[in-house]
Amino acid sequence: FGISGKHFITVTTFTSAGNIGEDGTLSCTFEPDIKLNGIVIQWLKEGIKGLVHEFKEGKDDLSQQHEMFRGRTAVFADQVVVGNASLRLKNVQLTDAGTYTCYIRTSKGKGNANLEYKTGAFSMPEINVDYNASSESLRCEAPRWFPQPTVAWASQVDQGANFSEVSNTSFELNSENVTMKVVSVLYNVTINNTYSCMIENDIAKATGDIKVTDSEVKRRSQLQLLNSG
């Protein structure tokens, strides 16, 4: 590789989180090199012998891949020349969490960067008016969370109010015995007010808002991964 031993290239990774049972991405970029055949990408995981993934001479080389990653990884091959070494990971498991290294070698030089990969479960909450309840109440449900999150309610009108005394939260284990369904009910709600249900663990924070008026119900949800970037 000629000068590759003398020069270092910039490799950038982003701490990210994987949602178990879904696709995940380990993000890594590097200084582009138009010579695809001269690019080597190696993904390694701390504590694992063998490679997570290797891409060289324009194609995957899985000869040294650790068995736990077999059939579960791929680079975005068409984006390698523009400096994308990110790794696609199939069916994220809790055991995939850890420290990964993205190692790059090109005709310009070599470099590497680490990333922390967190795994868990997170999902959007949905808030509905609970018409079955004896008093006006709201029901906030989110299908999959792990580790167990905290749940808090807030109100636009009663800012700073503590709703823990007028809400009830339960966690129901899902069929795979890892993730849990989150259900929180807020009692004694008033009309013409916006309420927020906030679910948070160390991986993600999700918020569901609901505005109830005489004529309509408006909902909005958002999900934010924590400590990423």
Epitope: G21, H53, K59, A74, K90, N91, E176
Partner: antibody, heavy 121, light 107 residues
Framework: EVQLVQSGAEVKKPGASVKVSCKAS????????IGWVRQAPGQGLEWIGD????????NYNEKFKGRVTITRDTSTSTAYLELSSLRSEDTAVYYC??????????????WGQGTLVTVSS | DIQMTQSPSSLSASVGDRVTITCKAS??????VAWYQQKPGKAPKLLIY???TLQPGVPSRFSGSGSGRDYTLTISSLQPEDFATYYC?????????FGQGTKVEIK
């Protein structure tokens, strides 16, 4: 265009073996998993196993373990399914299929035309 | 191994009907469920993968949804060319598994 062309129909006696071939073209053969699926007459689809041609790694349905071998020849871009100790219930159309996602084992997105294997005494 | 239980095994419907086919996984959670259409004497055709992603070239009347153990294929308005057998596939684990199939027939 991805193409998978399978070998012709076979008639075998019980206890014999059969080897079905699947020649791939239109993509990099060593970069995508190839799976095998069978369908008995009037029945549903049954997954047999798959192979990653780039390294020869295989996965098999427990039901067929010990009787089935999936191999590949990278020089001819061909995958093979060999089934031994044939019995009448192995009579089926055998399909090969490419798995989407390159080294990532995805769903089967391109299929061969099928090979009818008949087991009869 | 994960088994996929598909229902119904057959259904009769008319052109323009909304048709729903379900698959239930025996265990676990993952989004790796695909749906195939097969016509007599032909190889299966991939319609949907990763629960809800439409394969390029497949009409938008086909849609997939689901989570946990329950997955659904919906045909919003059945067309004459949609009369066929449909299969779900679980491909998230080491061992893949098909559902038993649903034959959609003309009423």
């Amino acid at each position: 265009e991805v193409q998978l062309v399978q070998s012709g129909a076979e008639v075998k006696k019980p206890g014999a073996s059969v080897k079905v071939s699947c020649k791939a073209s239109g993509y990099t053969f060593t970069s995508y998993w190839i799976g095998w699926v069978r369908q008995a007459p009037g029945q549903g689809l049954e997954w047999i196993g798959d192979i990653y041609p780039g390294g020869g790694y295989t996965n098999y349905n427990e039901k067929f373990k010990g009787r089935v071998t999936i191999t590949r020849d990278t020089s001819t871009s061909t995958a093979y399914l060999e089934l031994s100790s044939l019995r009448s219930e192995d009579t089926a159309v055998y399909y090969c299929a490419r798995l989407d996602g390159s080294s990532y084992r995805g769903a089967m997105d391109s299929w061969g035309q099928g090979t009818l294997v008949t087991v009869s005494s | 191994d994960i088994q996929m239980t598909q229902s119904p095994s057959s259904l009769s419907a008319s052109v323009g009907d909304r048709v729903t086919i379900t698959c239930k996984a025996s265990q676990g959670f993952n989004k790796y469920v695909a749906w195939y259409q097969q016509k007599p004497g032909k190889a299966p055709k991939l319609l949907i993968y990763y629960t809800s992603t439409l394969q390029p070239g497949v009409p938008s009347r086909f849609s997939g949804s689901g989570s946990g153990r329950d997955y659904t294929l919906t045909i919003s308005s059945l067309q004459p060319e949609d009369f066929a057998t449909y299969y779900c596939l679980q491909y998230g684990n080491l061992l893949y598994a098909f559902g038993q199939g649903t034959k959609v027939e003309i009423k």
